[in-house]
């Protein structure tokens, strides 16, 4: 005949206050004839759990129907879990005998430890807009967390990330832990519309990690490129001058003209676009009174993207002595 | 609520015999591991005994094997120590406590006093 | 057997001020088979018997304030309270009941009002 084997599957069992634990236990014979008990710790000083035979267990209940004949499982149910309940609890076969039973074999034990979700990872970037090609910081926190245990992974666009660091506390034995990870992410100029995920993996997650985002929008700032042209066509006396202000995010944008040096005031005509990348364009025309008055014209559109220093471009107005003489005629 | 409530104590002769008892209420005692712990005056706590849940397995600390024996009576929710041999380093307060599994003591009683001297 | 040692003896703090016990075990209490310290706390006032305070190493008895916290691992362990109130005046014992029996104690710390 087979040798009697007490099986407790887990090793670890985690729960949540509040909870059911169900406790596993099988037998791998039916001999020697006696009953199965349940207690938590060991030696002199551990307690009773369950005894199929007699005493009080309310918060108990068996899995299966263990007064059938051929039963083999002896696993239980511990309802309403309080952190008081955390201990190794074990399974002993007891073999009957006069006056009293006496332990056979107990099974390896199953440790209960309480269990606790992280929170769900907040990201948080830079305070300060950086430009491309530049290196920003972003930092993930969850929190709440038991067992100590924890993955954390970095991904931009889906891509998984290397540069970064993590630390788990307190070092030592604590009801809850906390992590923190920060991770350097290299600005690309097409970067506006990515992503930064943190993504935390827990046993008590059951393989369905959480993650926390951060847009790349919030830390970038695409510096804009400036061409100031002027149009071939002129309309009567007047010729047109295009600043293109092209691949800037965000969107916070002022233009101004200058003629020979002097702020034009008046109204100029705009339109902005969204490019695929997420990055603005913007164009302004600018209409020049050409007369013989004006024989050197320099015109200057200047940018102030985002709070930082203006940046300019000129343009010497390019006017043909056919041009003046069409707008002489064109004077009364 | 859970309760404990000692008697027994008192002033005895060095080499004469005590037995205090403890009384349980508000759980199921007879599903715990329970304990004598004791405070000589002015000092710390000291571990004396252990018995399990069914009164089947005890240990006393080396001090006091061989005199004291701890014993229970779950039909009466009751823990008792017999001390034999009292000598003057036995003088404390004996407190009962509950065993939470086989680790900790979440429950103690208020205790009493034994006092060995001639 | 296993020998606790706390320190200080005793510990005088203003009120509201942090106070911090120290509990040194003579071997480890920490089972690496499932990463439990087998250590527990005690706060006993003056005329009262011991009252659990932190089993586990750092999980707090039900209905303890929370401004007393364990810490530690192995054998060093830490009690702490975070902010010292009157009726805090009491011995703390730390506890270990990872090699027993026999269950050992530290020899106490006294905590006072400064």
């Known amino acids: 005949e087979e040798e009697l084997q007490m099986i407790q599957p887990e090793k670890l069992l985690l729960v949540t206050v509040g909870k059911t634990a169900t406790l596993h236990c099988t037998v791998t014979s039916l001999l020697p004839v006696g009953p199965v008990l349940w207690f938590r710790g060991v030696g002199p000083g551990r307690e009773l759990i369950y005894n199929q035979k007699e005493g009080h267990f309310p918060r108990v209940t068996t899995v299966s129907d263990l007064t059938k004949r051929n039963n083999m499982d002896f696993s239980i149910r511990i309802s309403s879990i309080t952190p008081a309940d955390v201990g190794t609890y074990y399974c002993v076969k007891f073999r009957k005998g006069s006056p009293e039973n006496v332990e056979f074999k107990s099974g390896p034990g199953t440790e209960m430890a309480l269990g606790a979700k992280p929170s769900a990872p907040v990201v948080l970037g830079p305070a300060a807009r950086t430009t491309p090609e530049h290196t920003v910081s972003f930092t993930c926190e969850s929190h709440g967390f038991s067992p100590r245990d924890i993955t954390l992974k970095w991904f931009k666009n889906g891509n998984e990330l290397s540069d970064f660091q993590t630390n788990v506390d307190p070092t030592g034995q604590s009801v809850a832990y906390s992590i923190r990870s920060t991770a350097r992410v290299v600005l690309d100029p097409w970067d506006v519309r990515s992503q930064v995920i943190c993504e935390v993996a827990h046993v008590t997650l059951q393989g369905d990690p959480l993650r926390g985002t951060a847009n790349l929008s919030e830390a970038i700032r695409v510096p804009p490129t400036l061409e100031v042209t002027q149009q071939p066509m002129r309309v009567g006396n007047q010729v047109n001058v295009t600043c293109q202000v092209r691949k800037f995010y965000p969107q916070s944008l002022q233009l101004t003209w200058s003629e020979n040096g002097n702020v034009c005031q008046r109204e100029t005509a705009s339109t902005l676009t969204e490019n695929k990348d997420g990055t603005y364009n913007w164009t302004s025309w600018f209409l020049v009174n050409i007369s013989d008055q004006r024989d050197d014209v320099v015109l200057t559109c200047q940018v102030k993207h985002d709070g930082q220093l203006a940046v300019s471009k000129r343009l010497a107005l390019e006017v043909t002595v056919h041009q003046k003489d069409q707008s002489s005629d064109a004077t009364p | 609520q859970v309760q404990l409530v000692e008697s027994g104590g008192g002033v005895v002769q060095p080499g004469r015999s005590l037995r205090l008892s403890c009384v349980a209420s508000g759980f199921i005692f007879s599903n715990y591991g329970m304990h004598w712990v004791r405070q000589a005056p002015g000092k710390g706590l000291e571990w004396v005994a252990v018995?399990?849940?069914?009164?089947?397995?005890?240990d006393h600390v080396d001090s006091v094997k061989g005199r004291f024996t701890i014993s229970r009576d779950n039909s009466k929710n009751t823990l008792y120590l017999q001390m034999n041999s009292l000598r003057a380093e036995d003088t404390a307060v004996y407190y009962c406590?509950?065993?939470?599994?086989?680790?900790?003591?979440?429950?103690w009683g208020q205790g009493t006093l034994v006092t060995v001297s001639s | 057997d296993i020998v606790l040692t706390q320190s200080p003896d005793s510990l005088a703090v203003s009120l509201g001020e942090r106070a911090t016990i120290n509990c040194k075990s003579s071997q480890t209490v920490l089972n690496s088979s499932n990463n439990k310290n087998y250590l527990a706390w005690y706060q006993q006032k003056p005329g009262q018997p011991p009252k659990l305070l932190i089993y586990?190493?750092?999980i707090r008895e039900s209905g303890v304030p929370d401004r007393f916290s364990g810490s530690g691992s192995g054998t060093d362990f830490t009690l702490t309270i975070s902010s010292l109130q009157a009726e805090d005046v009491a011995v703390y014992y730390c506890q270990q009941y990872y090699n027993t029996p026999p269950w050992t104690f530290g020899q106490g710390t006294k905590v006072e009002i400064k």
């Open positions: 406590a509950k065993g939470s599994g086989s680790y900790y003591f979440d429950y």
């Open positions: 018995i399990s849940y069914d009164g089947r397995n005890e």
């Open positions: 586990w190493a750092s």
